[in-house]
């Protein structure tokens, strides 16, 4: 069954800034994400942001920036203007809708033990212990190294010192080691099956275009299920609506968002895909 996770973090740099991260774990395509605070949707919550995978984002104060992080996760930055931080005790909820299959919602809040100086990681104590262990380990290695050097110096006193030859093999080995990973990366880039982690390229298109077209972010949160939009839609008189095969509507007199069978509506960093665009009425 699909699940929704929510994580709330206090920013380390700005104590009045919070970030809500939400993600959807499960199959299916996401048609809308709603972020609220003070309770879930349908139980007295106040909307903060609404994110559509194709048409962009909308947000309300105190939300500062809502954006897609991946195809199935979002983040919302909040600016707390008040002197006393109301966000610290607030519940944030995220609802992922997949129309008409269903919707899933989950809530979360800032961990009560969060240090304002930290970004509230889920397990801060083990992280500190790891740092301490690292420092102690490094100290131990240095002490051991010093002792070993002293031991070598003592041995040098009792031995004649032979002439040292420069070691070419060592430098060659080092060069080869340094170059090999780079070569591997290059090969991976040319191999379509290589498992390299390429960066996701989310857009932050928050507004609709002045001519009435909604902004189209480059991160559709679903793979297309239906056919590409028909390219032969007629243009009618100004002010009327044109039904496109995929269920979106263009205002007549404007160019439809597709000009040929080979052109797709949502180009992004993962390559072309067909239009699904099933989420709106104009």
């Amino acid at each position: 069954t699909p699940e929704v996770w929510v994580q709330v973090q206090m920013e380390a740099t700005e104590l009045s800034s919070f970030t809500v991260h939400c993600g959807f774990l499960g199959p299916g395509s996401i048609s809308l994400v709603t972020v609220s605070w003070g309770g879930p949707d349908g139980a007295g919550g106040t909307k903060l942001a609404v994110l559509h995978p194709e048409l962009g984002t909308r947000q309300w104060a105190p939300a500062r920036q809502a954006r897609w992080e991946t195809q199935s996760s979002i983040s919302l930055a909040l600016e707390d203007s008040g002197a006393s931080s109301p966000f610290a005790n607030t519940t944030f909820c995220c609802k992922f809708a997949s129309f008409p299959e269903g919707s899933w919602e989950s809530c979360g809040s800032l961990p009560p033990s969060s240090d304002p100086g930290l970004s509230a990681p889920p397990t801060p104590v083990p992280i500190l212990r790891a740092d301490l262990a690292g420092i102690l380990g490094l100290s131990g290695v240095l002490l051991f190294g010093c002792g070993y050097l002293l031991h070598l110096l003592r041995r040098q006193k009792h031995r004649p010192t032979p002439r040292l030859q420069p070691s070419h093999t060592n430098s060659q080995a080092l060069t080869a080691q340094a170059w090999a990973p780079s070569q591997a990366s290059q090969a991976a880039l040319h191999d379509p099956y290589a498992t390299i982690n390429t960066s996701f390229c989310p857009a932050t298109l928050d507004t609709a275009h002045p001519n009435g077209w909604a902004s189209l972010p480059t991160h559709a949160a679903h793979q297309p299920q239906g056919p590409a939009a028909s390219a032969s839609t007629p243009i009618l008189a100004r002010g009327s609506f044109v039904s496109v095969e995929n269920g979106l509507y263009t205002q007549a007199g404007e160019r439809p968002p597709h000009t040929g069978p080979g052109l797709t509506l949502f180009p992004d960093c993962r390559g072309p895909r067909a239009v699904e665009g099933r989420f709106g009425v104009r």
Partner: nanobody
Amino acid sequence: EVQLVESGGGLVQPGGSLRLSCAASGYTFSTDCMGWFRQAPGKGLEGVAHIDSDGIPRYVESVKGRFTISQDHAKNSLYLQMNSLRAEDTAVYYCVVGFKFGDYCAPNDWGQGTMVTVSS
């Protein structure tokens, strides 16, 4: 819990009429739009009509002049009067409440749907 319950669907002959109703209950966000979507058998979802928060109705071209969307705020209900029905209007009709992106209404909540079959 937000609940949207559609009713009024059924079998009707071409040229006939039907009136769909949608009863909304439970707290909802101050959404921007309320409307109807439909899904014909084996086809994708299609927006039929919606009413913006400003009360202006909007229709898809294929239903203009035949369908009328209306609201009753007192009863917290939405209606779709469908006249001069055609075979291609056969679909499951969903009542939705949602948010506007430009002139689009993106569903945030919806009902279970009601089936409309136009056949002789």
